[in-house]
């Protein structure tokens, strides 16, 4: 399963789409910056087996997909870009699920790293709470878009490390 290679390409395409989605000048949103507490430590460990690592990345993509599939998201972003972005994420999720099934037969370790997945879930809960508190304002969404781009970039480093491990 060559997921790290295909996923890295998908990640790059998703990042490009995210970059194109901006609707307002980020300069007007500086005071809306927020610490979402990206769970960096969950993407630092070398202790993961491949299936576990993929399950953490899967959770991250799934949560991003959920976030950008809400009606509030649809009201904010340009529809065709949003659809392309969702399609890209969906393709990545399908690739990952197929890859995990392949890996399970190879590895003896548990399929999921529960603590890491929970940390990712909580991270996205903080993002959702922030959007709610900010009443889904354009600037709040702009801050979240920047955060998701950053988290994708950080997870890309994780994927590259995973590829080197193979």
């Amino acid at each position: 399963c060559d997921l790290p290679q295909t996923h890295s390409l998908g990640n790059r395409r998703a990042l490009i789409l995210l970059a194109q989605m901006g609707r307002i000048s980020p300069f007007s949103c500086l005071k809306d910056r927020h610490d979402f507490g990206f769970p960096q430590e969950e993407f630092d460990g070398n202790q993961f087996q491949k299936a576990q690592a993929i399950s953490v990345l899967h959770e991250m993509i799934q949560q991003t997909f959920n976030l950008f599939s809400t009606k509030d998201s649809s009201a904010t972003w340009e529809q065709s870009l949003l659809e392309k972005f969702s399609t890209e994420l969906n393709q990545q999720l399908n690739d990952m699920e197929a890859c995990v099934i392949q890996e399970v037969g190879v590895e003896e370790t548990p399929l999921m790293n529960v603590d890491s997945i929970l940390a990712v879930k909580k991270y996205f809960q903080r993002i959702t709470l922030y959007l709610t508190e900010k009443k889904y304002s354009p600037c709040a969404w702009e801050v979240v878009r920047a955060e998701i781009m950053r988290s994708f970039s950080l997870s890309k480093i994780f994927q590259e490390r995973l590829r080197r491990k193979e």
């Epitope: 980020p26 005071k31 809306d32 910056r33 920047a146 955060e147 970039s153």
Partner: antibody, heavy 121, light 107 residues
Framework: EVQLVQSGAEVKKPGESLKISCKGS????????IGWVRQMPGKGLEWMGI????????RYSPSFQGQVTISADKSISTAYLQWSSLKASDTAMYYC??????????????WGQGTLVTVSS | DIQMTQSPSSLSASVGDRVTITCRAS??????LNWYQQKPGKAPKLLIY???SLQSGVPSRFSGSGSGTDFTLTISSLQPEDFATYYC?????????FGQGTKVEIK
């Protein structure tokens, strides 16, 4: 290794034009904004303006609006600061520095080495 | 514009001293305050960001505190290499603004 490398010192006459540069390396250039800071001889730091290299959106300090132009060429990971007509009062050290944009990350964590601009007749 | 006022503008201290520099914003800036150190002929160096976060590679003798309008940079035990000028800077809103600087000199 993250680096911002600025162009060399310049000596110019009043009324001349000038464009100085700041080249970023070791990171994704379009993921960070680039700010420009002036330091006149023996004085403190003054923020001039900032650019988002991903789309060349800019924001200037009111004190520098109309006095300078900030631009960027993302294809060569370089930001620029330019003057169309220099004055003696533009004599200063100019620094570029990277800014994380809307991300909760350290502001101006890497700086260029500075470009000394001397304007004298 | 948000005005940043540092005090004192200069101070004399000895190696081993505890040094405190304050910075006051003309309006609330939450915790969007950074501290920089600058030595003669060198570019500024980030020490503290978001009021109290220590920048990677900066010695733990440097610490920052405060929120709203009043902020403090503390050097717990001054070292020879700490003699420099220190600047605060607000990153709450544009235009970004710096304090006028505090020069820390050898007594």
């Amino acid at each position: 290794e993250v680096q911002l490398v600025q162009s060399g010192a310049e000596v110019k006459k009043p009324g001349e034009s000038l464009k100085i540069s700041c080249k970023g390396s070791g990171y994704s250039f379009t993921s960070y904004w680039i700010g420009w800071v002036r330091q006149m001889p023996g004085k403190g730091l003054e923020w001039m303006g900032i650019i988002d290299p991903s789309d060349s959106d800019t924001r200037y300090s009111p004190s520098f609006q109309g006095q300078v132009t900030i631009s960027a060429d993302k294809s060569i990971s370089t930001a620029y600061l330019q003057w169309s007509s220099l004055k003696a009062s533009d004599t200063a050290m100019y620094y570029c520095a990277r800014h994380p944009g809307l991300n909760w990350a350290p502001d101006f964590d890497y700086w260029g080495q500075g470009t000394l601009v001397t304007v004298s007749s | 514009d948000i005005q940043m006022t540092q005090s004192p503008s200069s101070l004399s201290a000895s190696v081993g001293d505890r040094v405190t520099i304050t910075c006051r914003a003309s309006q609330s800036i939450d915790r969007a305050l950074n501290w920089y150190q600058q030595k003669p002929g060198k570019a500024p160096k980030l020490l503290i960001y978001f009021a109290s976060s220590l920048q990677s590679g900066v010695p733990s003798r440097f610490s920052g505190s405060g929120s709203g309008t009043d902020f403090t940079l503390t050097i717990s035990s001054l070292q020879p290499e700490d003699f420099a000028t220190y600047y605060c800077q607000q990153s709450f809103d544009f235009p970004l603004t710096f304090g006028q600087g505090t020069k820390v000199e050898i007594k």
